[in-house]
Amino acid sequence: HTTVDTSGLLQHVKFQSSNFENILTWDGGPASTSDTVYSVEYKKYGERKWLAKAGCQRITQKFCNLTMETRNHTEFYYAKVTAVSAGGPPVTKMTDRFSSLQHTTIKPPDVTCIPKVRSIQMLVHPTLTPVLSEDGHQLTLEEIFHDLFYRLELHVNHTYQMHLEGKQREYEFLGLTPDTEFLGSITILTPILSKESAPYVCRVKTLPDRTWAYS
């Protein structure tokens, strides 16, 4: 998602999107200086008029949050950055066509790992996004991707692995040894758009078996 670098003032204008938080980023070229300022505009695909992004006019930082301006995940957008340096002409570069649905990456899920004596329970919490429903609710990833599922793995000493996967949010690995440390990893996948998050990792120890003490 990067434009071609043909200027020494501005390069690599691109969207970086994660969980539908859409940040426009760019680099200053070799000709840029500390007094180079940048202005950001954006538009929906198919529209002619560019809109100036308030808060991202004549700024010195090399990023601009366009999440709210590009929040319709079914639409395509463009953004452009204009760089101005003292005494020089402005240089403008535009992004490739951007779709948050296609281009967003998925962050690791938020998971609670609960040890028991002979099992480990994993509770996946819904991941909120900045995308809003018609009634103003923040949508979760599950409400956007019909095919979203979770892949869970449990590792013991790098030798033995157990696997679970599903569209549920609650899982339990059964038949484990008490008082033993396990490494769990939980990943989000959406097959149709080929998205896969980095794993959430939890290190958890099953509880000691106290029953012998009372027998």
Partner: antibody, heavy 117, light 107 residues
Framework: EVQLVESGGGLVQPGGSLRLSCAAS????????MYWVRQAPGKGLEFVSV????????HYVESVKGRFTISTDNAKNTLFLQMNSLKSEDTAVYYC??????????WGQGTQVTVSS | DIVMTQSPSSLSASLGDRVTITCQAS??????IDWYQQKPGQAPKLLIY???RLETGVPSRFSGTGSGTSFTLTISGVEAEDLATYYC?????????FGQGTKVELK
Amino acid sequence: EVQLVESGGGLVQPGGSLRLSCAASGFTFSSSWMYWVRQAPGKGLEFVSVINTRSGITHYVESVKGRFTISTDNAKNTLFLQMNSLKSEDTAVYYCATRIQGLIDYWGQGTQVTVSS
Amino acid sequence: DIVMTQSPSSLSASLGDRVTITCQASQSIRSFIDWYQQKPGQAPKLLIYGTSRLETGVPSRFSGTGSGTSFTLTISGVEAEDLATYYCLQDYSWPLTFGQGTKVELK
């Protein structure tokens, strides 16, 4: 207790329209994936369409794209299927179903749609 | 679309028999296969989800195995109430697709 009750089926001529409804209760309707599934006489089951009641995201099977529209009224906990340009091959029992805790395990009793001249 | 090829289309069993139904997916669906039972005039009922996990309240004589593209539903000892049509469903990607169904009848 989860309940899904379909209505709106009937006899319609080819090219005609029909609107099916599914009244839902016993679960959080406003944050769920809801489905229409059909079964032609003596035949197997086919998923027709799905909608997420919160995001409004929809998917359709290819054979009904451009003719059927799935929608909801979240205030009334009701799922709809607007069926236009009906064909004889759309004749079937239409079920609504929902995904709860990751599983499609609740179904209505079905409503019969017959397309015939 | 993912095509689910189910076999046999029908079978005759005596009470107590072990019955096996297979489903082949046209591409990998990982473990995302569910099995439903349908009786005449009724909606389908979920028996097994995620290849092998038994839905609450379903008798333990029902079991499922497989992975990737090849899956099996087994009824270890058929009872009279099991006479019905069984469908596999791939719940991996839209459009979700069923197998053609297997009618289990009494011999």
